[in-house]
């Protein structure tokens, strides 16, 4: 089938188009939604910084890249992108910075080619467990998603539901095992205090995992063993104090891994000895020469690679009779 040989980029400026859940009218080949800019040659629609409150209904069938950034969408309902005929080509969807606070179950259903989804910089107080899987079945149809970008989606403290934010996000990632094919997952800048222990084991295809700029204190209960394809693990700017032997061994056992550990408050006491030994031998840590101690005070700014066992002591624990109040 032959497409038109020419297609003008369209810069529309009429009132925002309010969407219903499903658009039954087949889109005209060259039409462009109001307040959007379209290029059929680039298979791209950009509806950027337009204060749209709903997803336009009249998206052109050719759209492969859809930018809906900088809007005021608030809620993404079930079937927000469902159309008749479906948007069969849509592969990359960017919804970042669009003031989304709720993403409902099945919001991304009927997008058979969706490979990359960016929901970053939205205060997601309510992310349905079935946002990505589309159904509450124990095993859902596999999602086509390959990249899921969820940086800075933590809502302000006063807008959070009365539940664990980490748990809400992980429930959406694991529901129905739909994201088994996910290769890139970005969860930076989300104030995560911990990583639920089962999350990584159920995402076996991961190549890139970004957990930077969170508040992770420990990886003790996190297993990387099954992530045999993992190529990059970003843990910069967390609250990590030390990595223990089990974690070190698992990371060392991953064949393609590069780990980023900058700007963590490493505690350089006797518990750090194994990590220092490992750092001196391993090639997997990028910029390992930049890692420095934060505590105790006497060790502040010391380079981890320059430490030896004599530097890494723990204050003796006094028996109760000798402790002072």
């Amino acid at each position: 089938s032959s497409s038109p040989t020419s297609s003008a980029s369209s810069f529309s400026s009429s009132a925002p188009f309010l969407a219903s859940a499903v658009s039954a009218q087949p889109p005209l080949p060259d039409q462009c939604p109001a307040l959007c800019e379209c290029s059929e040659a680039a298979r791209t629609v950009k509806c950027v910084n337009r204060n749209l409150t709903e997803v336009p209904t009249d998206l052109p069938a050719y759209v492969r890249n859809l930018f809906l950034t900088g809007n005021q969408l608030a809620v993404l309902p079930a079937g927000a992108f469902a159309r008749r005929p479906p948007l069969a080509e849509l592969a990359a969807l960017n919804l970042s910075g669009s003031r989304l606070d709720e993403v409902r179950a099945g919001a991304f259903e009927h997008l058979p080619s969706l490979r990359q989804l960016d929901l970053s910089h939205n205060p997601l107080a309510d992310l349905s467990p079935f946002a990505f899987s589309g159904s509450n079945a124990s095993v859902s149809a596999p999602s086509p998603l390959v990249e899921l970008i969820l940086n800075h989606i933590v809502p302000p403290e006063d807008e959070r539901q009365n539940r664990s934010f980490e748990g809400m996000v992980v429930a959406a990632l694991l529901a129905g095992r739909a994201l088994q094919g996910l290769r890139r997952l970005e969860l930076a800048s989300n104030h995560f205090l911990y990583l639920p222990r089962d999350v990584l084991a159920q995402l076996p295809s991961l190549r890139h995992l970004d957990l930077s700029n969170n508040s992770l204190v420990s990886l003790t209960y996190v297993s990387f063993r099954n992530l045999t394809h993992l190529e990059s693990l970003h843990l910069e700017d967390n609250a990590l104090k030390v990595l223990h032997n089990g974690t070190l061994a698992e990371l060392q056992g991953l064949p393609h891994i590069r780990v980023f550990l900058d700007n963590n408050p490493w505690v350089c006491d006797c518990h750090m000895a194994d990590m220092v030994t490992w750092l001196k031998e391993t090639e997997v840590v990028q910029g390992k020469d930049r890692l420095t101690c934060a505590y105790p005070e006497k060790m502040r700014n010391r380079v981890l690679l320059e430490l030896n066992s004599a530097d890494l002591d723990c204050d003796p624990i006094l028996p109760p009779s000798l402790q002072t109040s």
């Epitope: 497409s3 059929e40 040659a41």
Partner: antibody
Framework: QVQLQQWGAGLLKPSETLSLTCAVY????????WTWIRQPPGKGLEWIGE???????NYNPSLKSRVTISVDTSKNQFSLKLSSVTAADTAVYYC????????????????WGQGTTVTVSS | EIVLTQSPATLSLSPGERATLSCRAS??????LAWYQQKPGQAPRLLIY???NRATGIPARFSGSGSGTDFTLTISSLEPEDFAVYYC?????????FGGGTKVEIK
Amino acid sequence: QVQLQQWGAGLLKPSETLSLTCAVYGGSFSGYYWTWIRQPPGKGLEWIGEIDHSESTNYNPSLKSRVTISVDTSKNQFSLKLSSVTAADTAVYYCAGWFGELYHYYYGMDVWGQGTTVTVSS
Amino acid sequence: EIVLTQSPATLSLSPGERATLSCRASQSVSSYLAWYQQKPGQAPRLLIYDASNRATGIPARFSGSGSGTDFTLTISSLEPEDFAVYYCQQRSNWPLTFGGGTKVEIK
């Protein structure tokens, strides 16, 4: 890493049909838009046309009446046919792919064949 | 069709100098513009896509800027291997079009 290898007749007589084929190795065939471009001796680049994974084609209006681009997905190949050639069609012909991966915003032709010199002469 | 006009046609510079190449479109192409480098006897090589993004493996001395109708390719400090012909190309509208090229030659 995707690579392209192209071949076809290099010497044609006026009124004959130019026929070139480009084979895709080492990557997703469906994740690209496949393009033909030519470059007359000492001149700049001219886009001939392209075909996508659903076999939808777009051609340069200046050549549209003479050009056909097709794909053979079973062989990971795509082809160019240009009918009724004249001396003005003498050029180096390149096959190329754009849209680095299916799910990345990517608007440059990042994979190119080695080029085939086609001379039209009686 | 969208006409891309590159200037200057030729740029004579010495290694280490800064090169600034211009590409002007006859109508807006948004950010759907790429830059290519071509050396004699070789296929073009993608340098910049989407007006300002460096392609994989391209050195940081190459940078692109602009949106709409005016675009610039900058080479911050010319290396000997950078002397070549540079083309801009738009993907906003069919037919896809290339600029006429700028030749960067050794002074």
